[in-house]
């Protein structure tokens, strides 16, 4: 017997609004395999079952988040494989404030990532960069999380804001700082960056 799931990963990240097919197949030494997907903590969406295989179509909606299980049976043996599906949203929608920095004075800078999911501090991180390095002396304040106002119901996206108290930018002042936001997902790291110019 052979039992296969494609893609084979036990965790899959799917961008909101994009689709993914997960195929579970099995062949038996004798007879025809029975293969089917079952929802554990997720609505299954669209499933196409054929002799010896079953295709789960994930539509990239938040309701797809969960862990479906493929069950394959051959005579007196059964196999199971679960796939943890995480639907995420991480558009390039960073907003920084102020629009530019003034050298020679203390100031607070904020960086907001809009329409984010999951809004989880463990998966989303902020950094204030000078060149490619974190800016030394910047004091990170408590991050804030707020639900976005949605036109459509059922899509609870969030905006996350990180503020830093900056020391006085020395002279000569750097041309710009950058806010960098990173989302860490299973086998996937996404990054967006926004420039904050410094007045010269």
């Amino acid at each position: 017997q052979s039992f296969q799931v494609n893609p084979p990963e036990s965790e899959v990240a799917v961008a909101m609004g994009t689709s993914l097919q997960i195929t579970c197949s099995m062949s038996c030494d004798e007879g025809v395999a029975r293969v089917h997907w079952r929802g554990l903590d997720t609505s299954l969406g669209s499933v196409q079952t054929l002799p010896g295989s079953s295709i789960l179509s994930v539509r990239g909606m938040l309701s797809d988040t969960g862990t479906p299980v493929c069950v394959g049976s051959c005579g007196s043996r059964s196999f199971q494989h679960s796939v943890k599906i995480l639907v995420y949203a991480f558009p390039d929608q960073l907003v920084v404030s102020p629009e530019f920095l003034v050298p020679g004075q203390d100031q607070v800078v904020s960086c907001t990532a809009h329409n984010i999911w999951p809004a989880d501090p463990n998966s989303l991180s902020f950094a204030l960069l000078l060149g490619e390095q974190r800016l030394e002396g910047a004091q990170a304040l408590e991050p804030e999380q707020e639900e976005e106002i949605q036109e459509a119901e059922g899509t609870p996206l969030f905006r996350m804001t990180q503020r830093w108290r900056l020391p006085s930018l020395g002279t000569p002042a750097p041309p710009a700082l950058h806010c960098q936001v990173t989302m860490q997902l299973p086998k996937l790291v996404l990054t967006h960056r926004k420039e904050i110019p410094v007045l010269q």
Epitope: S10, L40, R77, S78, Q80, S82
Partner: antibody, heavy 120, light 107 residues
Framework: EVQLLESGGGLVQPGGSLRLSCAAS????????MHWVRQAPGKGLEWVAV????????YYADSVKGRFTISRDNSKNTLYLQMNSLRAEDTAVYYC?????????????WGQGTTVTVSS | DIQMTQSPSSLSASVGDRVTITCQAS??????LNWYQQKPGKAPKLLIY???SLQSGVPSRFSGSGSGTDFTLTISSLQPEDFATYYC?????????FGGGTKVEIK
């Protein structure tokens, strides 16, 4: 409170039969796969059989295949194990246990066990 | 059938020690590996499911890792109530199989 309560164990002669029962309460019995797992005196755990939530699929350990039958009555919230042609090596504490969708996620609720002794 | 090999079969440790138990499957089982704790005269208790997910109500000092064929159960700081026998179990295919167990004793 989620609970599993086994009964039906006892002393039986080699070649004899026993029927174990497991009464479930505190959870939606018909949504869970159910197992029997046994443990011989001083030994480790040995899986015996599983039945799917609706009773349509049943799988057995090679050591009991053809002799033991797992079944369930969802209207009575009860799991059964019919044991025939018993052997001395079937002597063990028998546990019933639950698992979401057969078994992938582990056996998360266990009964206290019922003792089966096969001896002449 | 998938064989599960657990090691060590027993170990002696002190309260506060970090304890690591390993389990090896004879073939790839993805992340379908569960860990149980059993105390004398009691039923087993599920600690970790799907290789690394902590079962509800289990203290966070227990953690699991691994995928494929090699898995680990770690107790970060052993407590008096953790002296017990630990079993791994594969949930990838029937017949389901358990490791031989690891008895954790007081040093």
């Amino acid at each position: 409170e989620v609970q599993l309560l086994e009964s039906g164990g006892g002393l039986v002669q080699p070649g004899g039969s026993l029927r174990l029962s497991c009464a479930a309460s505190g959870f939606t019995f018909s949504s869970y796969g159910m197992h029997w797992v046994r443990q011989a005196p001083g030994k480790g755990l040995e899986w015996v059989a599983v039945i799917s939530d609706d009773g349509s699929d049943k799988y057995y350990a090679d050591s009991v295949k053809g002799r033991f039958t797992i079944s369930r009555d969802n209207s009575k919230n009860t799991l059964y194990l019919q044991m025939n042609s018993l052997r001395a090596e079937d002597t063990a504490v028998y546990y019933c246990t639950t698992s979401k969708y057969y078994y992938y996620y582990g056996m998360d609720v266990w009964g206290q066990g019922t003792t089966v002794t096969v001896s002449s | 059938d998938i064989q599960m090999t657990q090691s060590p079969s027993s170990l002696s440790a002190s309260v506060g020690d970090r304890v690591t138990i390993t389990c090896q499957a004879s073939q790839d089982i993805s992340k379908s590996l569960n860990w149980y704790q059993q105390k004398p005269g009691k039923a087993p208790k599920l600690l970790i499911y799907a290789a690394s997910s902590l079962q509800s109500g289990v203290p966070s000092r227990f953690s699991g890792s691994g995928s494929g064929t090699d898995f680990t159960l770690t107790i970060s700081s052993l407590q008096p109530e953790d002296f017990a026998t630990y079993y791994c179990q594969q949930g990838y295919s029937t017949p389901l199989t358990f490791g031989g167990g690891t008895k954790v004793e007081i040093k």
